[in-house]
């Protein structure tokens, strides 16, 4: 339950998260599982641990092993296992099974492909993607953020695809690449003009000054999968990230549900230690998607402060 | 919001089993660090805590009651529950539950509590 | 078990006054630099109110007249000014090691 499957190739970066979770506070320790000798913090070394993950810059085929996490809380030990298998790499194109991630499946609206792992280093864009070994050229794909958008998917674009790209770690650079398949599927959806499910067109909301608030703006783009589709946060106009207000920050990454069948997102402002002065901002919930944009605006308004216990 | 409500008999029988849910809301058993736990406090007396069981399902008792007690918890739900075996008139008490929270481990939000009696 | 040892047991204070709530474990109660320490707020017929978290942090929506201070086995509650409606009773919690354990409890009440 608590050990972990890591690969990677050798001369790239491999970072490995510890299979059991904690929080913020507890301290993590990392071993050599076979000698119980303790894996070193300082980051001079090839191999060293940083809380939660432990890093192979670069990785070398003699660090396959499994290794031992600790996440020690006060009261508390949990122990994890991480079983890492580093391979030295193929001279041929062909990507061995044991290299390769969980398989995707797309389709002729929903052709994302996730760079698997990739959420474990400090990378930069643009990723460079490869189907069966060729780069991958022509106006059809596009690299986005952390995965690759095929347009108009056909069932020639089944194969194996590889992303590649360069983990950062105090000035030096490592590459990684990871490999998955991915296959096409005929689906049989739509998409609509984008529906606000919450917030109500003007809402008030009520939060209590000094405390932390929540606002969710959830909006339904169709059925099935769908290709292009969006909900954010404005402030007054502007994207939270460019309004320069640390307090208050949009939910990293959007959820994505299917309630009675419709795709639907949903993103988080999290507004922290609420100011009278945010009650004088005007918050948009957007949702865009290839048909347009649909806005609902709300405004906050103070509500007398409740015992929080019960 | 988080918010927490225990729920249970009022009146139990020497040597009885007794069972306490604790129904929540506003946050997640399976999100990593909440933990939920079980406290007691006799009539005029000081907080006695009992148990509480992590998003992990780790659990930890009162090693003066250990042999007592058992936590389990319905993430689907959003419940925890407390069993006490042996019950006597000393355990007569107000039972409260409690979220652990935070960067650290402590109880942030406590339901009511629930006054449960033994008494034949 | 670390015992938690409240002092004094109770004390009347007037309104605009300081009050002082100590707190000494039997043993320290630091982990990885910091002090597990909690102070809680009770009043007749009510749970516990979380007033400050490990030793000196302020929970959310409490008033600033509450301040936590000290480290490893001595700690304090202190409440400048009281006012009328902080009659309760307070008790120290540490969570540094199971079982957590907490203060006998200190009756506040007001002049």
């Known amino acids: 339950k608590f050990s972990k499957q890591s690969w990677g190739l050798e001369n790239e970066a491999l970072i490995v998260r510890c299979p059991r979770q904690g929080k913020p506070s507890y301290t993590v320790d990392w071993y050599y599982s076979q000698t119980n000798k303790s894996i070193p913090t300082q980051e001079r070394n090839r191999v060293f641990a940083s809380g939660q993950l432990l890093k192979f810059l670069p990785a070398a085929v003699a660090d396959s092993g499994i290794y031992t996490c600790i996440v020690r809380s006060p009261t508390f030990n949990r122990t994890g296992y991480a079983n890492v298998t580093i391979y030295k790499k193929q001279s041929d194109c062909n990507v061995p099974d044991y290299l390769m991630y969980s398989t995707v499946s797309g389709s002729e609206k929903n052709s994302k492909i996730y760079c698997p792992t990739i959420d474990l280093y400090n990378w930069t864009a643009p990723l460079e993607w490869f189907k069966n070994c060729q780069a991958l050229q022509g106006s059809r794909y596009r690299a986005h953020k952390s995965f690759l958008v095929i347009d108009n998917v056909m069932t020639e674009d089944a194969g194996d695809y590889t992303c590649k790209f360069i983990h950062n770690e105090n000035g030096a650079n490592y590459s990684v690449t990871a490999t998955r398949s991915f296959t096409v599927k005929d689906e049989q959806g739509f998409s609509l003009f984008p529906v606000i499910g919450a917030p109500a067109q003007n809402e008030i909301k009520e939060v209590e000054i000094g405390k932390n608030a929540n606002l969710t703006c959830s909006a339904c783009f169709g059925k099935g999968t769908q290709f292009l589709a969006a909900v954010l946060w404005q402030l007054n106009g502007t994207k939270i990230t460019d309004f320069g207000e640390p307090r208050i920050q949009q939910e990293e990454g959007q959820n994505q549900s299917f309630s009675n069948g419709l795709a639907c997102l949903d993103m988080v402002l999290r507004i922290a230690d609420v100011k009278e002065e945010d009650l004088l901002l005007q918050y948009d919930c957007l949702a865009l998607n290839l048909h347009g944009l649909r806005r609902h605006t709300v405004r906050l308004s103070r509500k007398n402060p409740i015992d929080h216990h019960s | 919001q988080v918010t927490l409500k225990e729920s249970g008999p009022t009146l139990v029988k020497p040597t009885q089993t007794l069972t306490l849910t604790c129904t929540f809301s506003?946050?997640?058993?399976?999100?990593?660090?909440?933990?939920v736990g079980w406290i007691r406090q006799p009539p005029g007396k000081a907080l006695e805590w009992l148990a509480h069981i992590w998003w992990d399902d780790v659990k930890q008792y009162n090693p003066a009651l250990k042999s007592r007690l058992t936590i389990t918890k319905d993430t689907s739900k959003n419940q925890v529950v407390l069993t006490m075996t042996n019950m006597d008139p000393v355990d007569t008490a107000t039972y409260y539950c409690?979220?652990?929270?935070?960067?650290?481990?402590?109880?942030?939000?406590w339901g009511q509590g629930t006054t449960v009696t033994v008494s034949s | 078990d670390i015992v938690l040892t409240q002092s004094p047991a109770s004390l009347a204070v007037s309104p605009g006054q300081r009050a002082t709530i100590t707190c000494r474990a039997s043993?320290?109660?630091?982990?990885?630099?910091?002090?597990?320490m909690q102070w809680y707020q009770q009043k007749p017929g009510q749970p516990p109110k979380l007033l400050i978290y490990?030793?000196?942090n302020v929970e959310s929506g409490v008033p600033a007249r509450f301040s936590g201070s000290g480290s490893g086995t001595d700690f304090t509650l202190t409440i400048n000014p009281v006012e009328a409606n902080d009659t309760a009773n307070y008790y120290c919690?540490?969570?540094?090691?199971?079982?957590?354990?907490f203060g006998q409890g200190t009756k506040l009440e007001i002049k």
């Open positions: 043993e320290s109660v630091e982990y990885s630099g910091t002090s597990l």
């Open positions: 919690q540490q969570s540094r090691k199971v079982p957590w354990t």
């Open positions: 506003g946050f997640s058993l399976s999100t990593s660090g909440m933990g």
């Open positions: 490990v030793a000196s």
């Open positions: 409690a979220h652990i929270g935070g960067d650290y481990d402590y109880f942030d939000f």
